[in-house]
């Protein structure tokens, strides 16, 4: 049962409708719940989760990461710059989420749900951004060749890649969640 999920027969009390910000907050936490389930399966299947951060860092994946210049941290926070970074980062993660689609057995449904709900989140955040021109969309041809390259790796590297994607995506979403709460 994912965190925050009640397994009883829940007849919900009548509450105020959720605001746009509350929905975004819950959406990110929902995706994080999905990532948790996927990480659990990955860790049960391989010993990647015990690998040291240093060893994992030596990879050639160009996974999105928050940096000081992105304006998402408390020091030097910039709402517009940060929102552009969040959207751009999520768009860049899409190819990696596509890669994850055939990497799970018992959590295949969750992998699909993480992908779908991320797409919905991107579309929702895009309407919040005033500076849409600053958002760079990844090149489909480059993404297609990256996907082919990742899928051609040996089993150990594929396990490593899966673990890295999940860990990086989790960290990126957690940073995004903190930043969006300040907006």
């Amino acid at each position: 049962v994912p965190p925050g999920e009640d397994s009883k027969d829940v007849a919900a009390p009548h509450r105020q409708p959720l605001t746009s910000s509350e929905r975004i907050d819950k959406q990110i936490r929902y995706i994080l719940d999905g990532i948790s389930a996927l990480r659990k399966e990955t860790c049960n299947k391989s010993n990647m989760c015990e690998s040291s951060k240093e060893a994992l860092a030596e990879n050639n994946l160009n996974l999105p990461k928050m940096a000081e210049k992105d304006g998402c941290f408390q020091s030097g926070f910039n709402e517009e710059t940060c929102l552009v970074k969040i959207i751009t980062g999520l768009l860049e993660f899409e190819v990696y989420l596509e890669y994850l689609q055939n990497r799970f057995e018992s959590s295949e449904e969750q992998a699909r749900a993480v992908q779908m709900s991320t797409k919905v989140l991107i579309q929702f955040l895009q309407k919040k951004a005033k500076n849409l021109d600053a958002i760079t969309t990844p090149d489909p041809t480059t993404n297609a060749s990256l996907l082919t390259k990742l899928q051609a790796q040996n089993q150990w590297l594929q396990d490593m890649t899966t673990h890295l994607i999940l860990r990086s995506f989790k960290e990126f979403l957690q940073s995004s969640l903190r930043a969006l709460r300040q907006m």
Epitope: P2, A12, L18, I24, I31, D33, G34, A113, V120
Partner: antibody, heavy 122, light 110 residues
Framework: EVQLLESGGGLVQPGGSLRLSCAAS????????MAWVRQAPGKGLEWVSS????????DYADSVKGRFTISRDNSKNTLYLQMNSLRAEDTAVYYC???????????????WGQGTMVTVSS | QSELTQPPSASGTPGQRVTISCSGS????????VNWYQQLPGTAPKLLIY???QRPSGVPDRFSGSKSGTSASLAISGLQSEDEADYYC???????????FGIGTKVTVL
């Protein structure tokens, strides 16, 4: 195989009550938002209610607010719709659907049951 | 009265391209993502397009969706006889705090 199976439909008099059930299988039920959508004979689709991945949050169509209650039992992988004060205009096939989009915009209903017929007539 | 307006019918010959429009307002299509559903005669609806232009796995790439402002459209290229069905657009409506469906468009393959 991912499946949703509705039950509990039937003939009921105006003012009466009915409880619909939807048994889910083949997926992690507690991870998904769920919804009820209905279709009156020869008419289009009408969303009735949604319950989000954390069961404490629900949304209802104005036409059923105060009369219908959506709920879920994650230990039984089952979704419910308690329908009270039924009217002739509630006559429809009631579909149970899974919401794959999460918390934004009601999600996208990616898995549907085959539906159960509810007839409200004296 | 549906909040989303669709033409009641559309038709084309096999191989043709058919486009279905869906018009809404700032509180639904203008603010939220659009989904499209296909309902074949006597069956339950099926998700065809989600999040404006995304196809779930298993949906042929003959189907495509787009959105601009408060309108959306579904295009079926290379129309086939099995595409004969009712098509519904849908979106969340912030004013109603609910999910709204279009009235549906019946597609006939001539």
């Amino acid at each position: 195989e991912v499946q949703l199976l509705e039950s509990g439909g039937g003939l009921v008099q105006p003012g009466g009550s009915l409880r619909l059930s939807c048994a889910a299988s083949g997926f992690t039920f507690s991870f998904y938002g769920m919804a009820w959508v209905r279709q009156a004979p020869g008419k289009g689709l009408e969303w009735v209610s949604s319950i989000y991945p954390s069961g404490g949050y629900t949304d209802y169509a104005d036409s059923v607010k105060g009369r219908f209650t959506i709920s879920r039992d994650n230990s039984k992988n089952t979704l419910y719709l308690q329908m009270n004060s039924l009217r002739a205009e509630d006559t429809a096939v009631y579909y149970c659907a899974r919401s794959a989009g999460g918390w934004i915009g009601g999600g996208a209903f990616d898995i549907w049951g085959q539906g159960t017929m509810v007839t409200v007539s004296s | 009265q549906s909040e989303l307006t669709q033409p009641p019918s559309a038709s084309g010959t096999p191989g043709q391209r058919v486009t279905i429009s869906c018009s809404g307002s700032s509180s639904n299509i203008g603010s939220n993502t659009v989904n499209w559903y296909q309902q074949l005669p006597g069956t339950a609806p099926k998700l065809l397009i989600y999040s404006n232009n995304q196809r779930p796995s298993g949906v042929p790439d003959r189907f495509s969706g787009s959105k601009s402002g408060t309108s959306a459209s579904l295009a079926i290229s290379g129309l086939q006889s099995e595409d004969e069905a009712d098509y519904y657009c849908a979106a969340w409506d912030d004013s109603l705090n609910g999910y709204v469906f279009g009235i549906g468009t019946k597609v006939t393959v001539l």
